[in-house]
Interface confidence: medium
């Protein structure tokens, strides 16, 4: 079953290569287990950036080596992606799945265009 997902259209990563955006979903029921996946679309290729399953009211748990962190609040997930470089600029899509209890719902946002600008190297000082 389909569900609405919203996310901001554009986000600019900071000088340390960190970008944060919000992903909101319209929960048709009282989900207790939610899975959030961040997908990156660039040059018509879609790759999975990170994913986490969480119990409502608890923190999101990503894999130890994940570049993503996040928190949840109600029907909203605050996602942070770290270690981004200019080449990582692209459309980052939020996919939300309501895993439990049944029925299963899935929604995909329109994507957040994340722009990453590599910082200029500091000039050597004499």
């Amino acid at each position: 079953k389909a569900m609405h997902v919203a996310q901001p259209a554009v986000v600019l990563a900071n000088s340390r290569g960190t970008a944060s955006f919000v992903c909101e979903y319209a929960s048709p029921g009282k989900a207790t287990e939610v899975r959030v996946t961040v997908l990156r679309q660039a040059d018509s290729q879609v790759t999975e950036v990170c994913a986490a399953t969480y119990m409502m009211g608890n923190e999101l748990t990503f894999l130890d080596d994940s570049i993503c962190t996040g928190t949840s609040s109600g029907n909203q997930v605050n996602l942070t992606i770290q270690g981004l470089r200019a080449m990582d600029t692209g459309l980052y899509i939020c996919k939300v799945e309501l895993m439990y209890p049944p029925p299963y719902y899935m929604g995909i946002g329109n994507g957040t265009q994340i722009y990453v600008i590599d910082p200029e190297p500091c000039p050597d000082s004499d």
Epitope: H4, V5, A6, Q7, P8, A9, V22, E24, Y25, A26, S73, G74, N75, Q76, N78
Partner: nanobody, 127 residues
Framework: EVQLVESGGGLVQAGGSLRLSCLAS????????MGWFRQAPGKEREFVAA????????YYADSVKGRFTISRDNAKNTVYLQMNSLKPEDTAVYYC????????????????????WGQGTQVTVSS
Amino acid sequence: EVQLVESGGGLVQAGGSLRLSCLASGRTFSSYDMGWFRQAPGKEREFVAAISWGGVNTYYADSVKGRFTISRDNAKNTVYLQMNSLKPEDTAVYYCARGSAPYSSSRSSAQETYAQWGQGTQVTVSS
């Protein structure tokens, strides 16, 4: 400074419909929850409906559930309140309000969580 301008109010017979609009100036409209409140003569201002920043979650006062529908068009910086099956007790000045924090998940009906308000539009329902 963001400005909110309501329109669409007027005089309508009981059972009729009206559609209120609230146009917001500024480029950050889509980042904020929006709400509608109303104040009847001699009464306190009360919550009517709210819509989340992304437009996917809506909230209603019990007194208007099933009759009123809130929606938004982020491309037009506008939030709407479609009011059907109007009753004389819906007579009030209707105010549009913008949430106080971008991408908030507070989802509150409390007036204190709204930072900016319009001037209001009068809705009169005659019996």
